[in-house]
């Protein structure tokens, strides 16, 4: 069969090979398409099918406006004046080029190091569906690679049968990367030999959050080992401005205290032994934990354990500076 590609809504003429150019003609057109259940033989006299396909005086078949339901096989069997039979066989496929794709809900700013929605690419009115793809600085973006994720949706219009495609792009920009990346989206038609359609590019700014300097936890006495009844002071040092809120944890459990950068443990008893750390919470960066320090009791004559070893735990008597 000869492959024919026709644009939806456009006319199409299929020639009946071997047919005399004028009546009388011995020919028969039949079709098997989305409008038929099996083969439909068209009456040369015309009829209700004429709005879809009708036989012209020269024997050709005329489709005034090709539709999705006209995809299928068209066959003509003709006999010339000498009684020689010729068959024509066409496989018709239809297409519709959508409007230029657009990027909607586009971000003007992205944050490095975290996932960001870049925008949603929309293409309306294609057939067959086709595909959307994203580009960064002119190069194709591969979903599920290097912090790139794409959420796609395809809808079909209930009356026209044409497709609407949507593609939402999420990226995690690398720290220290291009501060003004260029994103674009393109629609590739489902039928071959048709050019891709491109959106206008968007160029969001990449914002680099200033990395928080490490949260320092200072313990006095050094090493965190103290005689029974002694005092331990824990100080949480955060260079960030404005000062973040400081909370305290013991053995992984938050302590029910008001936020404070200093924690004093007076008159140490066995119940105060354990692993302590502070948590600095900055509005734009989220929580940051310090290293853990171990507080332990040493009996007279013992050497203090090194910082970081774990002692016992229990409800202690806590005081805030």
């Amino acid at each position: 069969a000869q492959n024919i590609t026709a644009r939806i809504g456009e006319p199409l003429v299929l020639k009946c090979k071997g047919a005399p150019k004028k009546p009388p003609q011995q020919l028969e057109w039949k079709l098997n398409t989305g409008r038929t259940e099996a083969w439909k033989v068209l009456s040369p006299q015309g009829g209700p099918w004429d709005s879809v396909a009708r036989v012209l005086p020269n024997g050709s078949l005329f489709l005034p406006a090709v539709g999705i339901q006209d995809e299928g096989i068209f066959r003509c069997q003709a006999m010339n004046r000498n009684g020689k039979e010729t068959k024509s066989n066409y496989r018709v496929r239809v297409y519709q080029i959508p409007g230029k794709p657009e990027i909607i809900d586009s971000a003007s700013e992205l944050t490095a190091g975290v996932p960001n929605k870049v925008g949603t690419c929309v293409s309306e009115g294609s057939y067959p569906a086709g595909t959307l793809s994203w580009h960064l600085d002119g190069k194709p973006l591969v979903p599920n690679e290097k912090g790139v994720s794409v959420k796609e949706e395809t809808r079909r219009h209930p009356e026209t049968g044409l497709f609407t495609l949507q593609s939402e792009l999420m990226v995690t920009p690398a720290r220290g990367g291009n501060p003004h990346p260029t994103f674009s989206c393109s629609f590739s038609p489902g039928l071959p030999r048709r050019r891709a359609l491109h959106t206008a590019p968007i160029q969001p700014r990449v914002w680099e959050p200033v990395p928080l300097e490490e949260v320092q936890l200072v313990v006095e006495p050094e090493g965190g080992a103290v005689a029974p009844g002694g005092t331990v002071t824990l100080t949480c040092e955060v260079p960030a401005q404005p000062s973040p809120q400081i909370h305290w944890m013991k053995d992984g459990v938050p302590l029910p205290l008001s936020p404070s950068p200093v924690l004093i443990l007076p008159e140490i008893g066995p119940q105060d032994q354990g692993t302590y750390r502070c948590v600095a919470t900055h509005p734009s960066h989220g929580p940051q934990e310090s290293r853990a320090v171990s507080i332990s009791i040493i009996e007279p004559g013992e050497e203090g354990p090194t910082a970081g070893s774990v002692g016992g735990s229990g409800p202690g008597t806590l005081a805030l500076a």
């Epitope: 259940e37 009456s43 006299q45 015309g46 009829g47 209700p48 099918w49 004429d50 709005s51 879809v52």
Partner: antibody
Framework: EVQLVESGGGLVQPGRSLKLSCVVS????????MTWIRQTPGKGLEWVAS????????YYPDSVKDRFTISRDNAKSTLYLQMNSLRSEDTATYYC????????????WGQGVMVTVSS | DIQMTQSPSSMSVSLGDTITITCRAS??????VNWFQQKPGKSPRRMIY???NLADGVPSRFSGSRSGSIYSLTISSLESEDVADYHC?????????FGSGTKVEIK
């Protein structure tokens, strides 16, 4: 709202002529084939004539061919049926309907107009 | 020409009954069969299009089906407002042909 309103019916003698009109509203007239269908008293429905949307192709059953002519004026959104050489068997209620091709099978009908052929 | 043989010509039924009217096409007309309802003194109204599709505004108790060349209109749980004449139509070939009609009455 789609409306089809027929007019021009009446009593006519055999052999004479009559012209029916159908004014439509509520849809884009030149997008649709149009058809006349008749119903004889106490009898079934019978297809009379169809015309394609541009008006350049017309279709008739043998019973009215060469006597009846269907036409349309897309600018006026009006369908016509010119009936010549009328016979008593043409006595019927004539309906103007939207459609006539395989894409639209008579989804809207006018109220009908009575034509009586009698001497 | 295609013949559309419609049966029965009339039926007398009770409210709440399920009824089926059939039309047999003398040759293949594919899906191109419509069903119309006509109440006394009124214009026909399309009920089913392309053999099986319910037209807009038609109650769901009406349905259309097809088995080969036999096309059926079924009304389940008949209501008093369904009393009417019913006509089938083939619109696949000229001349377009209607069935002879079925009169549905209440016992």
């Amino acid at each position: 709202e789609v409306q089809l309103v027929e007019s021009g019916g009446g009593l006519v003698q055999p052999g004479r002529s009559l012209k029916l009109s159908c004014v439509v509203s509520g849809f884009t007239f030149n997008n649709y084939w149009m058809t006349w269908i008749r119903q004889t008293p106490g009898k079934g429905l019978e297809w009379v004539a169809s015309i394609n949307n541009s008006g350049d192709n017309t279709y008739y059953p043998d019973s009215v061919k060469d006597r009846f002519t269907i036409s349309r004026d897309n600018a006026k959104s009006t369908l016509y049926l010119q009936m010549n050489s009328l016979r008593s068997e043409d006595t019927a209620t004539y309906y103007c309907t939207r459609g006539g091709d395989i894409t639209t099978g008579f989804d809207y009908w006018g109220q009908g107009v009575m034509v009586t052929v009698s001497s | 020409d295609i013949q559309m043989t419609q049966s029965p010509s009339s039926m007398s039924v009770s409210l709440g009954d399920t009824i089926t009217i059939t039309c047999r096409a003398s040759q293949d007309v594919g899906i191109y069969v419509n069903w119309f309802q006509q109440k006394p003194g009124k214009s026909p109204r399309r009920m089913i299009y392309r053999a099986t599709n319910l037209a807009d505004g038609v109650p769901s108790r009406f349905s259309g089906s097809r088995s080969g060349s036999i096309y059926s209109l079924t009304i389940s749980s008949l209501e008093s407002e369904d009393v009417a004449d019913y006509h089938c139509l083939e619109f696949d070939e000229h001349p377009l042909t209607f069935g002879s009609g079925t009169k549905v009455e209440i016992k």
